[in-house]
Interface confidence: medium
């Protein structure tokens, strides 16, 4: 009779451990219509092989609560249900899932889960994508405003997403060591909705010119959370009749030095 | 980037005076007002003056008017601030400083002056 | 000229804790108050102008408040670093006014 000799296995399924590692803090940022790869790194036991491995992964939108499947791959075939998505090949190999997403719109925003299968083991991961739109912005002079040495600015942000914007004045006399928020003849307008899903707001404020100060700076400053520091746009108050004829477009982020020199 | 370099450390006699220098850099000079502070040994700060940097325009504090003086070079972008008939309570570190931009107001690295018999 | 009374002189307390400096003006000055940090020989470094506004690069456990005469610089959780001397500054009018600062210890 045969004796059947059974090879000793050097892993057992019980020693084989399949982790998947996210975005740190579980969030990821991207600009409106930039490119993003959300990160998706698999920890495997033993050297991978792509060929009998899978990969799905899914987004959650935040308005809906449905799965949808966005990009999948197993062993000998990859889809994408999102045109343009894409996980690489090469970088799977050494255990880069991450997937990558080009163009991105305002509602590709949501919960994406990376799911990774390799028999008998499975293994997810889930990150928050938010997606931003960082305001262009612009101060004018509302030419309507006819009354002697009274001027009306506009500081216009368009374009901007998530609608939370903070828009303030500030003023710099001359001898001032630091500036002035200005709180009276500030209005700021309602927040409008764009068809793209983006948003405009627009502050006034209302000068009379000849109780200010020739050469003081006024300034708009603009905080969006798109925004790593303020946008801030100045003009100066040169005479009486100050204008701005033509709109002073701009999309300056705000300069400066370190605090104290030395 | 905006800098602004102070002239060094002074010892002086009382009745002496002191001329103490600070050149400015990475700014359109003459559009902005230098003020100066003093801090002595262990205390807190004190303004003394300031100077329209087109140099047409001081305003000085009370206490040290008669004593202090203060003038624009703007062909070298250096301010200066003299103060006359010292005595010891004058020993201090001074500072010019300019109004900054977002990140605060921009301060020299500051100059002893010590004056002492 | 505006006095700008600053207070406690000095203050212990423990990494972590929340603290409260107050500026007491003697007169009206709006919300023009500065508030500055100053470590060992350097110079003072600004923390906030307009009362309540963080200059940029500033954390967020520093913020100010108060508008008149009555100022309060708040430090919500101290780290290390924090523990050096502050001053408040008055802007309304010249002569530029200081407190007499507040030296922050640890306990």
């Known amino acids: 009779h045969h004796h059947h000799h059974h090879e000793q296995k050097l892993i057992s399924e019980e020693d084989l451990d399949l982790k998947v590692e996210m975005m740190a803090r579980g969030i990821q940022a991207t600009r409106l219509n930039d490119s993003v790869t959300i990160s998706c790194k698999v920890i495997y036991s033993q050297p991978l092989n792509i060929t009998s491995m899978g990969i799905t992964w899914f987004r959650k939108s935040l308005t809906l609560d449905k799965e949808v499947k966005v990009f999948e791959f197993f062993g000998d075939h990859q889809k994408a249900f999102r045109p343009g998505a894409n996980v690489s090949l090469w970088r799977l190999k050494s255990g880069d899932a991450s997937l990558k997403l080009p163009g991105v719109q305002l509602e590709e925003a949501g919960e994406y889960r990376c799911e990774v299968v390799v028999t008998p083991l499975k293994a997810q991961g889930t990150v928050q994508l938010k997606v931003v739109a960082s305001p262009t912005s612009r101060l004018f002079q509302d030419q309507a405003v006819v009354k002697e040495n009274e001027g009306k600015y506009m500081c216009e942000s368009s374009r901007f997403y998530p609608k939370d914007i903070n828009i303030t004045w500030e003023k710099w006399t001359q001898k001032s060591p630091h500036h002035v928020v200005i709180s009276e003849n500030v209005i700021t307008g309602p927040t409008i909705k764009n068809m793209d899903g983006t948003f405009n707001i627009t502050s006034y404020l209302k000068l009379n010119s000849s109780q200010e100060d020739p050469g003081t700076v006024y300034r708009c400053v603009i905080r969006h959370e798109s925004l790593h520091t303020p946008v801030s746009i100045d003009f100066i108050l040169t005479a009486p009749q100050q204008s701005l004829s033509e709109p002073e477009k701009t999309d300056i982020f705000s300069s400066g030095g370190g605090g104290s020199a030395g | 980037q905006v800098q602004l370099v102070q002239s060094g450390a002074e010892v002086k006699k009382p009745g002496a005076s002191v001329k103490v220098s600070c050149k400015a850099s990475?700014?359109?000079?003459?559009?902005?007002?230098m003020n100066w502070m003093r801090q002595a040994p262990g205390q807190g700060l004190e303004w003394m003056g300031g100077i329209y940097l087109s140099g047409d325009s001081t305003d000085y504090n009370e206490k040290f008017k008669g004593r202090v003086t203060m003038t624009v070079d703007t062909s070298t972008s250096t301010v200066y601030m003299e103060l006359s008939s010292l005595r010891s309570e004058d020993t201090a570190v001074y500072y010019c400083t300019r109004r900054g931009d977002y990140f605060g107001d921009f301060w020299g690295q500051g100059t002893l002056v010590t004056v002492s018999s | 000229d505006i006095q700008m009374t600053q207070s406690p002189s000095s203050l212990s307390a423990s990494v972590g804790d929340r603290v409260t400096i107050t500026c007491k003006a003697s007169?009206?000055?709006?919300?023009?108050v500065a508030w500055y940090q100053q470590k060992p020989g350097k110079a003072p470094k600004s923390l906030i102008y307009s009362a309540s506004n963080r200059y940029d690069g500033v954390p967020s456990r520093f913020s100010g408040s108060g508008s008149g005469t009555d100022f309060t610089l708040t430090i919500s959780s101290l780290q290390p670093e924090d523990f050096t001397t502050y001053y408040c500054?008055?802007?309304?009018?010249?002569?530029?006014?200081f407190g007499a600062g507040t030296k922050l210890e640890i306990k």
């Open positions: 990475g700014y359109t000079f003459t559009s902005y007002w």
């Open positions: 500054q008055q802007y309304i009018s010249y002569p530029l006014t």
């Open positions: 007169q009206n000055v709006g919300k023009y």
